[in-house]
Interface confidence: medium
């Protein structure tokens, strides 16, 4: 039986707001909206929390019974949805312990676990993984992309008891490996020799000057003489003009600078490759994985464009719980909204070509009405009447 | 002169789809726009939608998105609005309009039909 | 509701002058010169009055003006008669999205 932490799909309207907690940390962070957005696959089972307001700071937290992950699997999902073609601004969780004071969370607050999508121009699209280790923030040293589309995306960390991790993303892996390889929690555990140093009479050089090589006599040559068929033009004044001198061109036997050749260097013994030790500062930790205490799921973001939309948080110990999950929401609802953003994106090239077909017709009817000013009045007749009249266009 | 003739008046049952008709003379029928507006009895004018005879092309107001279909046939210069899944709401009259008329800007109706009332009843 | 506010009726006396607001936002009347009046009269169709704010159509008697401030347009009618007894309908159309809204309409009575 999967032990469900937490679990938020906001599907009981308006009674978001007696679970979360928005911060007083600061007065002017950003509200957060409950919707399903200008798109989606199910109006009411796509409703999640929206940022609101440009340019703000959002910090908003929601607590749950406290639990360690010690000895078990630690899963953290939810789905992100960045509709507003995000242009700068953070999609991530903070999982904090439960002596956090939710009232006062803010950005500088200490929490366990802070993932998800980050995105700032074209430079920074990127998933956060930090841990807190020991006081300290540590980030993943691998680059995880993120997506940055308008569609809704399910981001999952897998943290397991042997120290593996996993990061999906649309329940496809991204990336996974060691806690220990993929950050820098430990000292290594192999440092260079400090009493090892590179032997004086060790050659590195894989090429030398070849000693019998010598430059040919007739090398040195200038590199621009003058112009052989150039001749002095028949006006030329000397008093006037000088003395005439011919212009200069390239040598074509200029050679440019002599260089031996280069031949294998007999003592070459390669590059000299540090010798490592065991790092006596070195000692395993097992328990990397393990916090005592989770509590509170957070989301404390800066967002230049607001419209970012947040569902579908899963806190387990269950993996295959998290992606069955996944699959049953974000999974139902994907084709829908890609469906439903495709027929709006269609409504509005139809627009943008009508509004362009509107302004035309505005033009030529303007200029039908200057001609009708310009021109003198006329009875309005049809072509076949004017005709047998004998009426004939000016 | 200018003239916008509808179809007459329509009886339809709920779940019905009622298709009305808009005859255009005394303009290039390709010329302009024909829109549809509603009025419901009691109630104010609201825009249905467009369609230019050029091409075909529609747009749809968004509370008729989805079960109003706007066509026109230019080898009849006649314009078309059908209305599916009817409901008793639906019951109103419908009008054509176009700024085919001398003087005003294509963002103006100044020609209307006459009128089609269509009434949605079991 | 209609996207577009006008006050349920107004009245006059022959002779007396009326004006008709229609407040909407700076994404229709506000933000755009496309604001139309049309008259219409019980059982016909209705018949545009004023187009692109203050233009009149030929044929429109010119006691019909149209005037704009912010995002309310005005319909006034001066020297009221009989026959403008009728329900008035201003209208915008929304280039950013091209569509057409209507106000809800008011119902002019002449007195007397």
């Known amino acids: 039986e999967p032990a469900v932490y937490f679990k938020e799909q906001f599907l009981d309207g308006d009674g978001w707001t007696s679970r979360w907690i928005e911060s007083k940390h600061k007065s002017d962070f950003g509200k957060f909206v409950l919707s399903s957005g200008k798109f989606y696959g199910d109006e009411e089972k796509d409703k999640g929390l929206q940022t609101s307001q440009d340019a703000r700071f959002y910090a908003l937290s929601a607590s749950f019974e406290p639990f360690s992950n010690k000895g078990q699997t630690l899963v953290v999902q939810f789905t992100v949805k960045h509709e507003q073609n995000i242009d700068c601004g953070g999609g991530y969780v903070k999982l904090f312990p439960n002596s956090l004071d939710q009232t006062d969370m803010h950005g500088d607050s200490e929490y366990n676990i802070m993932f998800g999508p980050d995105i700032c121009g074209p430079g920074t699209k990127k998933v956060h993984v930090i841990f807190n280790y020991k006081g300290k923030n540590v980030l993943i040293n691998k680059d995880i992309r993120c997506k940055d589309d308008e569609f809704t995306h399910l981001y999952t960390l897998i943290v397991r008891p042997d120290n593996t991790y996993e990061v999906k993303i649309d329940n496809s892996q991204v990336e996974s490996g060691s806690l220990e390889d993929d950050w820098d929690f430990l000292p290594p555990k192999k440092i260079k020799d400090p009493d090892a140093s590179k032997p004086e009479d060790w050659d590195e050089r894989a090429k030398i000057d070849d000693p019998t090589d010598s430059k040919p006599e007739d090398w040195d040559k200038p590199e621009h003489i003058p112009d052989p068929d150039a001749k002095k033009p028949e006006d030329w004044d000397e008093e006037m003009d000088g003395e005439w001198e011919p212009p200069v061109i390239q040598n074509p036997e200029y050679k440019g600078e002599w260089k031996p050749r280069q031949i294998d260097n007999p003592d070459y013994k390669g590059t000299w490759i540090h010798p490592e030790i065991d790092n006596p500062e070195y000692s395993p930790d097992p328990s990397i994985y393990a916090y005592d205490n989770f509590g509170v799921l957070g989301l404390d973001l800066w967002q230049v464009k607001s419209g970012t939309i947040f569902d579908n948080f899963l806190i387990t110990n269950d993996e295959a719980y998290a992606e069955e999950f996944g699959n049953e929401t974000w999974g139902v609802t994907k084709a829908a909204e890609k469906q439903m953003k495709d027929k709006q994106d269609e409504e509005q090239r139809t627009r943008r070509m009508m509004r362009t077909k509107m302004r035309m017709r505005r033009m030529r009817r303007t200029r039908r009405k200057m001609r009708r000013k310009m021109s003198p009045a006329r009875p309005r007749t049809s072509c076949r009447e004017a005709c047998l009249q004998g009426w004939t266009e000016a | 002169q200018v003239q916008l003739v509808q179809s007459g008046a329509e009886v339809k049952k709920p779940g019905a789809t009622v298709k009305i008709s808009c005859k255009v003379s005394g303009y290039s029928f390709t010329d302009y726009f024909i829109h549809w507006v509603q009025q419901a009895p009691g109630k104010g004018l609201a825009w249905v939608g467009l369609?230019?005879?050029?091409?075909?092309?529609?747009i749809y107001a968004e509370k008729f998105q989805g079960r109003v279909t706007i066509t026109a046939d230019t080898s009849t210069d006649t314009a078309y609005m059908e209305l599916s899944s009817l409901r008793s709401e639906d019951t109103a009259v419908y009008y054509c309009a176009t700024p085919g008329g001398i003087l005003t800007d294509p963002d103006a109706f100044d020609i209307w039909g006459q009128g089609t009332m269509v009434t949605v009843s079991s | 509701q209609s996207a577009l506010t006008q006050p349920a009726s107004v009245s006059g006396s022959p002779g007396q002058s009326v004006t008709i607001s229609c407040t909407g936002t700076?994404?229709?009347?506000?933000?755009?010169?496309?604001v139309s009046w049309y008259q219409h009269h019980p059982g016909k169709a209705p018949k545009l009055m004023i187009y692109?704010?203050?233009k009149r159509p030929s044929g429109v008697p010119d006691r019909f003006s149209g005037s704009k401030s912010g995002n309310t347009a005005s319909l006034t009618i001066s020297g009221l008669q009989a026959e403008d007894e009728a329900d008035y309908y201003c209208s915008s159309y929304i280039p950013s999205s091209t569509r057409w809204v209507f106000g809800g309409g008011t119902k002019l009575t002449v007195l007397g």
């Open positions: 369609v230019d005879p050029e091409d075909g092309e529609t």
């Open positions: 692109d704010v203050n």
């Open positions: 700076s994404s229709d009347v506000g933000g755009y010169n496309y």
